[in-house]
């Protein structure tokens, strides 16, 4: 006889969240981000596929394009003309690296509701936009870029010397597009369509990287990338503007660059148009602390560019890199010359400030020992941007809305109060003048997206609320969460805690570091979120934290620039403080803690393996950084320098993983990549799996071929499912 | 379909004026730039003047600068060749055509004859 | 201004044949140079602009190349309605010249 099952009670009924809810996706969440047309109006793919048009004043909805249209061309995306007469379509979409794809586009003429024959556009494409007035196109095909006065008129080539790997017009090369445009476009139209803007990257002198794709032919693939690592040579970057209504007149015209800049090696950061003619620039020199804003002014006479230094501002870092991640790209003010931009203040603390004639003289619009983080709208009378201000956790994100119109300017958060405890990290979408905005909140609660009012702040409708996720989770044991911070030697180390569902404080845990910690980064977020972790959590009864040390960002220049010319050092002490910290707490097993991290991440977690504290019985490193000399030039110099003698050559050197590779001795090392990784190439597993075999250091390693550094597809199954196993293998959990 | 057609021409005394007329369709005329070119008889082809889409900005062959005004009505989707002080030489076909991106002309009227003749 | 020159300025020819027709530019035009085919009475009809590129809805034995100062439109096998006049055109600072024109005759 056995008893019988009680089943009154709601823990009973409640299960684990399981391996497979996480590979399937099960849990996962909506955001409703409104492709905004107009001040009151927003376009919207429906649920059933149908593109429709929604006005916020009226109420009415009423559908531009049937998902009949979008199938027969098997679109998976479209763009509609300002002038609401054509509609692109996309499809055969094919990634190429982290932002840019080729795809093939239809135009659907919206007033005849047909396709526009007749000078059809070439396949496949590399970007492709409207002019942000009427319906222009401007497209990249094989490097060069193509003018359309209408989608039925031929098109004009602008540029003519584009070739694959070697000239790059109007998109991006390998290093530009993921360390300092993060977009998939080097090409921006004027605000009435007037100009063209757009960079040339001349690659010619890059050394390349090459690796094998594998396919299923007989013979592999060699992928040739111009990827310039640390000290290698750079692309030669040039701008150009284009009048598109004359382009044959006087062609493209080169936009100077500013002689400080000029000087020596130097970047080409960001583009932002002020007005028809007036464009501003922004340049950054190799060793990347000084940065260059400069306001140009078409002249008519000479139909050229000219950038008065009158109107050039320097942004200078005495302690650090310029800027945070990158450096913040101004918001123009309705004068068309002063501007409203993120920089750190005095106290060192990323704040904004107005330039209207020097940065010397700029008013500091924000300040306390908080950070502001993005200016999303500036109006004739309010300035709309996020922070961590509230409560002081570094953690959160809310809206505020200062009035630039009154004197004082009066702020007000819009978002602190609206769901206190389900969200508190917000980003926001507005339309043309901030008439509305939507609000996205991801977290800590189930996300939830609301439009607004942007007069009174009013909340008009919920867009988006998980529904479905909210009641799918109510039968599901979910871990718990807190978010605290430690105090360590002058250093706030704020953490996230992850603990099972039933956590009892008097049990020992085993403890799960998951780190990435890298410059500017920010891994403990108010922030919602079913992934792996939370399983280790809810069924394997594991403690997992994530800890931001020095070098993250948010919370002042004195811990992000902590790791200036110095990777590798601090990040790793401070989560090796942490753990000891963890430990103290009394609910932590001592011999069962690990570490593990992904790209950054990998190389922190090797490193944290390799510290000889014998804190760590195991840990994993996915696409691990080994030495900064393999890694790309934008990003590795920004932080470390140069890797020559007479600059840091000797960090370079000493803040390698394979320098370590004794130290691995004493624990279990699990190390993975993809060979198709473009970012952070296979070469880096390959030097570490080579000095653990000369040092004669036993590891385990996986590779995922013909993948990239995201490891997407069955590849992430295959991934989470090993790692669970050696996870639950090192803490002895029973499979 | 792109449509061009002239209007206007006819004979007139040396010294005398003309207004040529050309009415567009078939395409949204205020995006364009538009032109005249004329073609004496039994002559090449000659670039007489162009207007910019919204008309402010226009250019003329050195033959006719001073004599000729070229201007557009957006609303009507029409463009005009005013001329002045015509001469022998002047005489024509002239042809409203559309200047695409200021680089070649891709759709022609049928042309006007205007015969300048005492 | 810029100065264009077509030659020949006139040649016969039969049907099938390879015809060439060359134009010279008196500086740098890079590729801004169309080609035009006029009828006697008719308007002149786009055939190639910017130096290369087929206009829609002119048959494909049509061709241009070159770049610079020296372009030719090339009829790969001339047909009974090519007989015409063909002009060559540039504009670059918005000035556009012609040609003064090849006349394609029956031999």
């Known amino acids: 006889l056995r008893p019988s099952r009680v089943h009154n009670s709601e823990e009973n009924t409640m299960r684990a969240l399981t391996l497979k809810d996480i590979l399937n996706g099960t849990f996962s969440y909506k955001t409703f981000f409104p492709n905004w047309i107009s001040g009151q109006e927003y376009l919207h793919q429906s649920a059933d596929n149908n593109i429709v048009l929604y006005n916020i004043e009226t109420g009415q909805s009423y559908t531009i394009l049937s998902n009949r249209t979008m199938k027969s061309v098997n679109a998976s995306n479209y763009g509609l003309s300002p002038d609401r007469q054509f509609v692109y379509l996309e499809s055969d979409y094919s990634k190429l690296w982290r932002y840019s794809y080729t795809a093939t586009y239809y135009i659907y003429d919206l007033s005849n509701g047909e396709f526009v024959r007749g000078n059809e556009l070439p396949r496949p494409i590399q970007y492709l936009c409207w002019s942000p007035v009427g319906s222009k196109l401007a497209y990249v095909y094989q490097n060069n870029i193509y003018l359309k006065q209408r989608p039925g008129d031929p098109p004009f080539q602008i540029t003519f010397n584009g070739r694959e790997n070697k000239i790059f017009n109007g998109i991006p090369d390998w290093v530009y597009e993921e360390e300092m445009l993060a977009t998939k476009y080097a090409l921006w139209w004027s605000p009435n369509g007037k100009f063209l803007a757009y960079a040339e990257f001349n690659d010619t002198d890059i050394p390349v990287i090459a690796y094998s794709y594998y396919g299923d032919e007989q013979y592999p693939r060699t992928i040739n990338i111009p990827y310039p690592k640390a000290g290698a040579k750079n692309p030669v970057v040039r701008i150009f503007i284009i009048d598109t209504t004359y382009p044959a007149y006087v062609g493209p015209q080169e936009v100077p660059v500013p002689a400080m800049i000029a000087s020596s090696d130097y970047y080409f950061s960001w583009l932002t148009w002020v007005t028809d003619e007036r464009v501003c620039l922004q340049w950054l020199k190799r060793v990347q602390n000084v940065s260059v804003l400069s306001i140009c002014d078409f002249r008519e006479d000479w139909q050229t560019w000219d950038c008065p230094k009158t109107q050039e501002h320097i942004e200078e870092s005495r302690t650090g890199w310029a800027g945070g991640f990158f450096v913040s790209t101004p918001v123009f003010s309705y004068d068309a010359i002063s501007y409203y931009k993120i920089f750190s203040d005095k106290d060192g603390y990323k704040h904004i400030h107005y330039i209207k004639d020097t940065v010397e003289n700029a008013i500091q619009i924000t300040s306390g020992k908080w950070e502001a983080i993005n200016i999303f709208r500036v109006t004739q009378d309010s300035l709309f941007y996020s922070s961590n201000e509230f409560e002081e956790y570094p953690g959160r994100r809310n809206i505020y809305r200062i009035s630039i119109g009154s004197y004082p300017p009066s702020k007000k958060c819009v978002t602190c109060h609206l769901r206190k405890e389900r969200c508190q990290y917000y980003t926001a979408s507005f339309s043309d003048y901030a008439k509305y905005y939507a609000l996205v909140c991801y977290g800590p609660g189930i996300p939830i997206s609301t439009l607004h009012d942007g007069r009174t702040d009013q909340e008009i409708k919920i867009l988006e609320e998980n529904k479905e996720l909210e009641n799918a989770l109510k039968n599901i044991q979910l871990p718990k969460e807190e978010i605290k911070k430690l105090e360590v030697d002058e250093i706030t180390l704020w953490y996230k805690m992850i603990l099972p569902p039933q956590f009892d404080r008097s049990k020992k845990y085993p403890l799960l570091i998951q780190v990435y910690g890298g410059p500017c980064s920010q891994s403990v977020r108010s922030v919602f979120a079913v992934n792996w972790i939370s399983y280790l959590a809810s069924k394997e009864g594991m403690v997992i934290a994530l800890v931001d040390g020095r070098g993250t960002a948010f919370q002042g220049d004195k811990l992000l620039y902590a790791v200036y010319r110095k990777l590798g050092v601090y990040e790793v002490e401070d989560q090796i403080t942490a753990v000891r910290k963890f430990i103290e707490m009394g609910f932590i097993d001592e011999k069962r803690i690990a570490i593990w991290g992904w790209s950054y991440g990998g190389y922190v977690s090797s490193l944290a393996l390799a510290s000889g504290t014998g804190l760590f019985k195991c840990g994993i490193a996915v696409a691990p950084v080994s030495s900064w000399e393999y890694y790309a030039s934008v990003y590795t110099e920004r932080f470390m320098g140069l890797p020559t003698k007479d600059d840091n050559l000797e960090h370079y050197k000493n803040s390698t993983v394979m320098a370590r590779a004794e130290y691995f001795r004493n624990v279990d090392y699990l190390l993975i990549h993809g060979t198709a990784d473009d970012n952070v190439h296979f070469q880096n597993s390959a030097q570490i799996a080579k000095a653990l075999v000369n040092a004669q250091v036993d590891f385990q390693a996986m590779w995922y071929s013909d993948q990239n550094h995201g490891l997407s597809g069955l590849s992430t199954n295959h991934l989470y499912t090993h790692m669970t196993h050696f996870l639950k293998q090192c803490f002895s959990l029973s499979d | 379909e792109v449509q061009l057609v002239e209007s206007g021409g006819g004979l007139v005394q040396p010294g005398g004026s003309l207004r040529l007329s050309c009415a567009a369709s078939?395409?949204?005329?205020?995006?364009?730039?538009m032109s005249w070119v004329r073609q004496a008889p039994g002559k090449g082809l000659e670039w007489v003047s162009w207007?910019?889409?919204?008309?402010?900005?226009?250019g003329y062959a050195d033959s006719v600068k001073g004599r000729f005004t070229i201007s557009r009505d957006n609303s009507k989707n029409t463009l005009y060749l005013q001329m002045n002080s015509l001469r022998a030489e002047d005489t024509a076909v002239y042809y409203c055509?559309?200047?695409?991106?200021?680089?070649?002309?891709?759709?022609w009227g049928q042309g006007t004859l205007v015969t300048v003749s005492s | 201004d810029i100065q264009m020159t077509q030659s020949p300025s006139s040649l016969s020819a039969s049907v099938g044949d390879r015809v060439t027709i060359t134009c010279r530019a008196s500086?740098?035009?890079?590729?801004?140079l169309n080609w035009y085919q006029q009828k006697p009475g008719k308007a002149p009809k786009l055939l190639i602009y910017?130096?290369?590129s087929l206009q829609s809805g002119v048959p494909s034995r049509f061709s241009g190349s070159g770049s610079g100062t020296d372009f030719t439109l090339t009829i790969s096998s001339l047909q009974p309605e090519d007989f015409a006049t063909y002009y060559c055109?540039?504009?670059?600072?918005?000035?556009?010249?012609f040609g003064q024109g090849t006349k394609v005759e029956i031999k």
């Open positions: 910017a130096a290369s």
């Open positions: 055109q540039q504009a670059r600072l918005l000035l556009p010249t």
């Open positions: 055509a559309r200047l695409l991106y200021g680089t070649w002309f891709d759709y």
């Open positions: 500086q740098s035009i890079s590729s801004y």
């Open positions: 207007i910019g889409p919204e008309g402010s900005r226009t």
């Open positions: 078939g395409f949204t005329f205020r995006g364009y730039i």
